[in-house]
């Protein structure tokens, strides 16, 4: 169904990292424009990205209102220059997205090691608590604020002079590991949400090594 000069969007895909959420679709428009609508399962449709020639729409502002909700989006196709035109069923062509639950599905962004400090044979490694676009009481929440104890970090560490990796895990953003005196170590961290079934792990952080700028040494 539909008008002769519009085609329905297809391959509707959610791209979301740390709750920054964009809906993408195909095809690149030829003589047509798109409008996106988003809704929770029980809510009203809200229109976004009106009559755009883009094939993506940033829906972050909508999904951060409640990251635990399940959202559905749909993309409407209109003839360029004649957006009042409708399909044969009396409405414009549209295609539904898959359902999307931000809390369960947003990708975990690559974490960053904020600092490490050596005191004797212990090293305290701190992971940066990245700010998200989720708000509460007019302030932006951090990843830890949103996920709480659902979020853990895994630390990979190894002597600069060898390749054998050790691991530690934490329910906070801090590690305190034992090291051999006089040895330099390298570190990388990964964010993990063990309770998830999809998108459980982030990519590894950039490697940071002792003897470089981020660290501090104290006897």
């Amino acid at each position: 169904s539909g008008t002769t000069n519009t085609v329905a969007a297809y391959n509707l895909t959610w791209k979301s990292t740390n709750f920054k959420t964009i809906l993408e679709w195909e095809p690149k428009p030829v003589n047509q424009v798109y409008t996106v609508q988003i809704s929770t399962k029980s809510g009203d449709w809200k229109s976004k990205c009106f009559y755009t020639t883009d094939t993506e729409c940033d829906l972050t502002d909508e999904i951060v209102k409640d990251v635990n909700q399940t959202y559905l989006a749909r993309v409407f196709s209109y003839p360029a220059g004649n957006v009042e035109s409708t399909g044969s069923a009396g409405e414009p062509l549209y295609e539904n997205s898959p359902e999307f639950t931000p809390y369960l599905e947003t990708n975990l962004g690559q974490p960053t090691i904020q600092s490490f400090e050596q005191v004797g044979t212990k090293v305290n490694v701190t992971v940066e608590d990245e700010r998200t676009l989720v708000r509460r009481n007019n302030t932006f929440l951090s990843l830890r604020d949103v996920f709480g104890k659902d979020l853990i970090y895994t630390l990979y560490y190894w002597k600069s002079s060898s390749s054998g990796k050790k691991t530690a895990k934490t329910n906070t953003n801090e590690f305190l590991i034992d090291v051999d005196k006089g040895e330099n170590y390298c570190f990388s961290v990964q964010a993990v949400i063990p309770s998830r079934t999809v998108n459980r792990k982030s990519t590894d952080s950039p490697v940071e090594c002792m003897g470089q700028e981020k660290g501090e040494f104290r006897e």
Partner: antibody, heavy 125, light 108 residues
Framework: QVQLQESGPGLVKPSQTLSLTCTVS?????????WSWIRQHPGKGLEWIGE???????RYNPSLKSRVTISVDTSKNQFSLKLSSVTAADTAVYYC??????????????????WGKGTTVTVSS | EIVLTQSPGTLSLSPGERATLSCRAS???????LAWYQQKPGQAPRLLIY???SRATGIPDRFSGSGSGTDFTLTISRLEPEDFAVYYC?????????FGGGTKVEIK
């Protein structure tokens, strides 16, 4: 030293909502701990109800999730429990507790190290 | 949910004796998430052991914890009069957090 004190009605009618508040003294509710509710039926074991972080992030026991709301009021240094549609099976001693991170094996993990004294709630008409 | 089964239900011992309490999990629990609590009548539980084997602040060294996977043990090397109470294991790794049914240590 952090202390917790539960407060709320000791008697609730069936089908009504049980409301309890836990007041935190001697420390800030926003200091990186989690705050939990646990209950103990008469002569029985302990049942975890749920927890909240100062940011409002919550986790609930799935068996109670449809009836439970835990909220936090950082300005009053309090957190609260609401349990709706109560029955006699909800008669119990209700405890609030602090979940604080303890070092173990390279990382930090949360345990309930400070508890309130508990308050008895009876559900009866 | 992870079910924790404690045994025995009751342990009748005399002061000075050794108490061995068992906690078995229905599925593997990381040691990082296993705790033991002591509860006396009319009181709230008190954290004794965290991380399966680390003593909480102020807990005497006669209390020790061990184990991994699905089998954990709390040992009281020499029972003092104040140790007669109910002991609970707890896992805090998987929601819902669960407690064992408890072991009552009573005076023989």
């Amino acid at each position: 030293q952090v202390q917790l004190q539960e407060s709320g009605p000791g008697l609730v009618k069936p089908s009504q909502t049980l409301s309890l508040t836990c007041t935190v003294s001697g420390g800030s509710i926003s200091s990186g701990q989690y705050w939990s509710w646990i209950r103990q039926h008469p002569g029985k074991g302990l049942e975890w109800i749920g927890e909240i972080y100062y940011s409002g992030s919550t986790r609930y026991n799935p068996s109670l999730k449809s009836r439970v709301t835990i909220s936090v009021d950082t300005s009053k240094n309090q957190f609260s429990l609401k349990l709706s549609s109560v029955t006699a099976a909800d008669t119990a001693v209700y405890y609030c507790a602090r979940d604080t991170p303890y070092y173990y094996d390279g990382g930090y993990y949360y345990y309930m190290d400070v508890w309130g004294k508990g308050t008895t709630v009876t559900v009866s008409s | 949910e992870i079910v924790l089964t404690q045994s025995p239900g009751t342990l009748s011992l005399s002061p000075g004796e050794r108490a061995t309490l068992s906690c078995r999990a229905s599925q593997s629990v990381s040691s990082s998430y296993l705790a033991w609590y002591q509860q006396k009548p009319g009181q709230a539980p008190r954290l004794l052991i965290y991380g399966a084997s680390s003593r909480a602040t102020g807990i005497p060294d006669r209390f020790s914890g061990s184990g991994s996977g699905t089998d954990f043990t709390l040992t009281i090397s020499r029972l003092e009069p104040e140790d007669f109470a109910v002991y609970y294991c707890q896992q805090v790794g998987v929601v819902p957090y669960t407690f064992g049914g408890g072991t009552k240590v009573e005076i023989k």
